[in-house]
């Protein structure tokens, strides 16, 4: 082993993750953002799409197991559907049962992501911090 | 660029993070991993260190900024040396001023970790959640 | 209601500027995006851009356009508009506004019904 | 840029036959895919989003399958009103992108 190596080795059990936008976090090949300012969730919705990115979408507590931990509560990219009841994320997919605890916190056609996978309905034009998420292949 | 934008930056590059242990989160490329098994403070140094890491060390606001919104308690790689009365970090280092307020929950000489940089002072043989990490280059 | 402004309507000399505008009724513009698409005779469908109809300014390009083209609207009249300049012959096309619904995959889910721009001396 | 492929670039058939038309993407796009169908002089109308989701009033003899790179538009019972040109979309990342369309003709 020369100590001018050609190659970076890595640990088996070590790897990269991403790619993701610069000062994001990275986990299990997603990439998430945490945003401070309180927006409504359309300028929510807005703010993740000028990135290329979508508000939070919760698809797998495994994958996902991240979330089980943050505080407060943030805007994600679930919407009520009237004309049929759903929810549904920005991607167009309906929410999967099981994986979101809904809770009606306000009338409303949008939802809050907070700790424990769960889900509180709010009114879309109430302003709140929220989670950008961009989904790595 | 912070995790908490108060504008919002649209990424010039994309960039990898890490490496990591498989699975870990990655960010400003530190690595970290919550468990959620009940340790005490010297089993939960012993499982980082088994991972080739350490527990948490807080060192800047400004690139861990993805701490303030923990939720819960965690052991951090903080302990109290009595014979001087400071806190120390793992590595030796002493802790900085201002980085985190530390609370007297508890007489002890271990720190857990609270969401906005706040540290719980505990007794060591307490069980709790804890916190590994990992520096890369 | 999608209307296309300059001398001869939708026709354009080479290297000319031409403006076209789109005026947004029957739903809140401030929760939307516009997006420009058009469509060559017998050709596929091409994106142009997009622009937020609400308070942020946040707009896209397709790489092609390579600053020949700038969006703009006017929130307070629901109205976007799509600046076309240094106009050549394959920009000949017709120019839809759409609305950009990002809760529906981003999908295009109402079209205007075109402006045809003719680019010819 | 992400490049749709759709397959076949026509198709003839009859009334009441089932048509399948494929779109392929040259990366993953998860399911941020979207179909429309365009009639002649006319400006192309949403189909279907989420790679699986009917548009308000589209009949159900449209579905829609596939997830990530490879995606399928069924018409299950061809009626006279769907012979058109129908053309899938990415939303997954700008640039959005078409596929060049699949023309539905009578046999």
């Known amino acids: 082993n020369s100590l001018f190596n050609q190659e970076v080795q890595i640990p088996l059990t070590e790897s990269y993750c991403g790619p993701c936008p610069k000062n994001w976090i990275c986990y299990k090949n997603n990439c998430y953002q945490f945003f401070d300012e309180s927006k409504n969730w359309y300028e929510s919705q807005a703010s993740c799409m000028s990135q290329n990115a979508s508000l939070l979408k919760v698809y797998s507590k495994e994958d996902q197991d991240l979330l089980k931990l943050v505080k407060s509560y943030h805007w994600m990219g679930l919407v009520h559907i009237p004309t049929n009841g759903s929810w549904q994320w920005e991607d167009g997919s309906i929410l999967s049962p099981n994986l979101l605890t809904i809770i009606e916190m306000q009338k409303g056609d949008c939802a809050l992501y907070a700790s424990s996978f769960k889900g509180y309905i709010e009114n879309c034009s109430t302003p709140n911090t929220y989670i950008c998420m961009q989904r790595t292949v | 660029n912070s995790l908490f934008n108060q504008e919002v930056q649209i990424p010039l590059t994309e960039s990898y993070c890490g490496p990591c242990p498989k699975n870990w989160i990655c960010y400003k490329n530190n690595c970290y991993q919550f468990f959620d098994e009940s340790k005490n403070w010297y089993e939960s140094q012993a499982s980082c260190m088994s991972q080739n890491a350490s527990l948490l060390k807080v060192y800047s606001k400004e690139d861990q900024d993805l701490l303030k919104l923990v939720k819960s308690y965690h052991w951090m790689g903080l302990v109290h040396i009595p014979t001087n009365g400071s806190w120390q970090w793992e590595d030796g280092s002493i802790l900085s001023p201002n980085l985190l307020t530390i609370i007297e929950m508890q007489k002890g000489d271990c720190a857990l970790y609270a969401s906005s940089f706040k540290g719980y002072i505990e007794n060591c043989s307490t069980p709790n959640t804890y916190i590994c990490m990992q520096r890369t280059v | 209601e999608q209307s296309g402004g300059g001398a001869g309507g939708g026709l354009v000399k080479p290297g000319g500027s031409l403006e076209l505008c789109c005026k947004a009724?029957?739903?809140?513009?401030?929760?939307?995006?516009m997006s420009w698409v058009r469509q060559s005779p017998g050709k596929g469908l091409e994106w142009i851009g997009r622009i937020y109809g609400g308070s942020s300014d946040y707009t896209a390009y397709a790489s092609w356009v390579n600053g020949r083209f700038t969006l703009s609207r006017d929130i307070d009249q629901s109205t976007g508009c799509l600046q076309l300049n240094s106009l050549t012959a394959a920009d000949t096309a017709m120019y839809y506004c759409?609305?950009?619904?990002?809760?529906?995959?981003?999908?295009?889910?109402?079209w205007g019904q075109g402006t045809l721009v003719t680019v010819s001396s | 840029d992400i490049q749709m492929t759709q397959s076949p670039s026509s198709v003839s058939a009859s009334v009441g036959d089932r048509v399948t038309i494929t779109c392929r993407a040259s990366q993953g796009i998860f399911s941020w895919l979207v179909w429309y169908q365009q009639k002649p002089g006319k400006a192309p109308e949403l189909l279907m989003y989420g790679a699986s989701t009917l548009q308000s009033g589209v009949p159900s003899r449209f579905s829609g399958s596939g997830s990530g790179t490879d995606f399928t538009l069924t018409i299950s019972s061809l009626q006279p009103e769907d012979f058109a040109t129908y053309y899938c979309q990415q939303g997954y990342s700008t640039p959005y992108t078409f596929g060049q369309g699949t023309k539905v003709e009578i046999k």
């Open positions: 009724s029957g739903f809140d513009f401030s929760i939307y995006w």
């Open positions: 759409v609305r950009l619904n990002p809760s529906f995959s981003r999908s295009f889910d109402y």
